[in-house]
C-alpha cells in the first residue's frame, strides 16, 4: 500500500518535499515515477537511480528517500501530484498528493503594510 | 560515449533465418532494457521486441510473434535477435536501441539491412 | 494498440519559420510521449522526451508540449540542418508504436 499526506502547503519561492511511502512484506521495489498533473517530474530505478526530466532540472531535487524536493515554487506549482511505486511481484500502487502554494506570508505583510501606511 | 554496433544482416531467402547481434559499449549494458525497432525501405519505423535489463520482462510486435525470439548476454554485453520464418515482409534495417527507464529511446545504433529474398 | 496520427505528414518551409508538428494518440497516453528526428541514411535522434522535456545537447528551439491525446512538437525558428522526418512515439504500453512521420522539406 502507498501512505501519503493527501493534503499539503507550501509558500510561493520556498520549497516542499513530496513523499510517498510504500509498504509491503514482499515486493520490492524496482521504479518510482513521479508527475505534475501529466507532466513528468522525474523517475528513480534500481538500475538506474534517479533522473530529473529536464523542464524541471533546475527546481527538482531527488530525495529524501524516493520523494523529491520541489524548490522555488510558485503559485502554478498547485495541483495533483502523482506517486508511481512499480513493485515486482507486486505491481504498480498509486499515490496522490495535493498540493497547494501560498503567498508567502512576507507578501501579505508587506501588502498588508502597504496598504494601512498613512498617506501623508 | 554510447556506442550500439549492430551486425549480422544480409540478404537471406524467405524461410530462412538470421542472428543479429548488438554490441553495447560505454554504459552498464545490464542496467538498461534493450529494444529492436525496424525501417522499411521508404517507410517508417516499427518496433519489433524490447526485453528488460535481466531478461525477465519481454515482448514482441504481433507481425513478428513466434519468429523472432530476442535475448541478450550481460555479461558480454550484446543484444541479440534470432529471426526464423523469414519473410519478404520482413527486409528493413534493423536497429537496436536503449531504453532507459522504458520510457523514451535515448540512443540507437547505425543500423544492419536485412533483406529477404528469393 | 495504440495508434498514432502524424500531421502534417510532409511541409515545405524557409529557414528561420516557426514549424509545428502534431501527433495524436488513439487513448490516453499521459505524457509517454517522444520526438525524434531521422534524416537520410542515418539513425533516428531523440529530441524530446515525456512530452516536454528536452533531450541533453538538442537546440532550445525544439520544443514539446501536449499531454493525454494531444502533442505539439514546434521548431521555433527552422535551420538548415532542420531539414529532416520527425516522428513522435508513444510508450505507455507495448506494443511501442510510432507516428507516420513528417518530412520538412526546403521551400
Known amino acids: 500500500t502507498i501512505d501519503t499526506k493527501r493534503n499539503i502547503s507550501a509558500e510561493e519561492g520556498g520549497s516542499v518535499i513530496l513523499q510517498c511511502h510504500f509498504s509491503s512484506d514482499t515486493a520490492e521495489v524496482t521504479q518510482v515515477d513521479w508527475k505534475q498533473q501529466d507532466q513528468l517530474l522525474a523517475i528513480y530505478s534500481v538500475d538506474l537511480g534517479w533522473h530529473v526530466a529536464s523542464v524541471f532540472s533546475d527546481r527538482v531535487v531527488p530525495g529524501p528517500s524516493l520523494g523529491l524536493t520541489f524548490q522555488s515554487l510558485t503559485m502554478n506549482d498547485t495541483g495533483e501530484y502523482f506517486c508511481t511505486y512499480h513493485t515486482y511481484p507486486g505491481g504498480i500502487y498509486k499515490g496522490r498528493i495535493f498540493l497547494k502554494v501560498q503567498e508567502s506570508s512576507d507578501d501579505r505583510n508587506g501588502l498588508a503594510q502597504f496598504q494601512t501606511a498613512p498617506l501623508g | 560515449e554510447v556506442q550500439l554496433l549492430e551486425s549480422g544482416g544480409g540478404l537471406v531467402q524467405p524461410g530462412g533465418s538470421l542472428r543479429l547481434s548488438c554490441a553495447a559499449s560505454?554504459?552498464?549494458?545490464?542496467?538498461?532494457?534493450m529494444h529492436w525497432v525496424r525501417q522499411a525501405p521508404g517507410k517508417g519505423l516499427e518496433w519489433v521486441s524490447s526485453?528488460?535489463?535481466?531478461?525477465?520482462?519481454?515482448s514482441y510486435a504481433d507481425s513478428v510473434k513466434g519468429r523472432f525470439t530476442i535475448s541478450r548476454d550481460n555479461s558480454k554485453n550484446t543484444l541479440y535477435l534470432q529471426m526464423n520464418s523469414l519473410r519478404a515482409e520482413d527486409t528493413a534495417v534493423y536497429y537496436c536501441?536503449?531504453?532507459?527507464?522504458?520510457?523514451?529511446?535515448?540512443?540507437w545504433g547505425q543500423g544492419t539491412l536485412v533483406t529477404v529474398s528469393s | 494498440d495504440i495508434q498514432m496520427t502524424q500531421s502534417p505528414s510532409s511541409l515545405s518551409a524557409s529557414v528561420g519559420d516557426r514549424v509545428t508538428i502534431t501527433c495524436r494518440a488513439s487513448q490516453s497516453i499521459s505524457s509517454y510521449l517522444n520526438w525524434y528526428q531521422q534524416k537520410p541514411g542515418k539513425a533516428p535522434k531523440l529530441l524530446i522526451y515525456?512530452?516536454?522535456s528536452l533531450q541533453s545537447g538538442v537546440p532550445s528551439r525544439f520544443s514539446g508540449s501536449g499531454s493525454g491525446t494531444d502533442f505539439t512538437l514546434t521548431i521555433s525558428s527552422l535551420q538548415p540542418e532542420d531539414f529532416a522526418t520527425y516522428y513522435c512515439?508513444?510508450?505507455?504500453?507495448?506494443?511501442?508504436?510510432f507516428g507516420g512521420g513528417t518530412k520538412v522539406e526546403i521551400k
Open positions: 536501441a536503449r531504453v532507459p527507464y522504458d520510457y523514451w529511446i535515448d540512443y
Open positions: 560505454g554504459f552498464t549494458f545490464s542496467s538498461y532494457s
Open positions: 526485453i528488460n535489463s535481466n531478461a525477465g520482462t519481454i
Open positions: 515525456a512530452a516536454s
Open positions: 512515439q508513444q510508450s505507455y504500453s507495448t506494443p511501442l508504436t
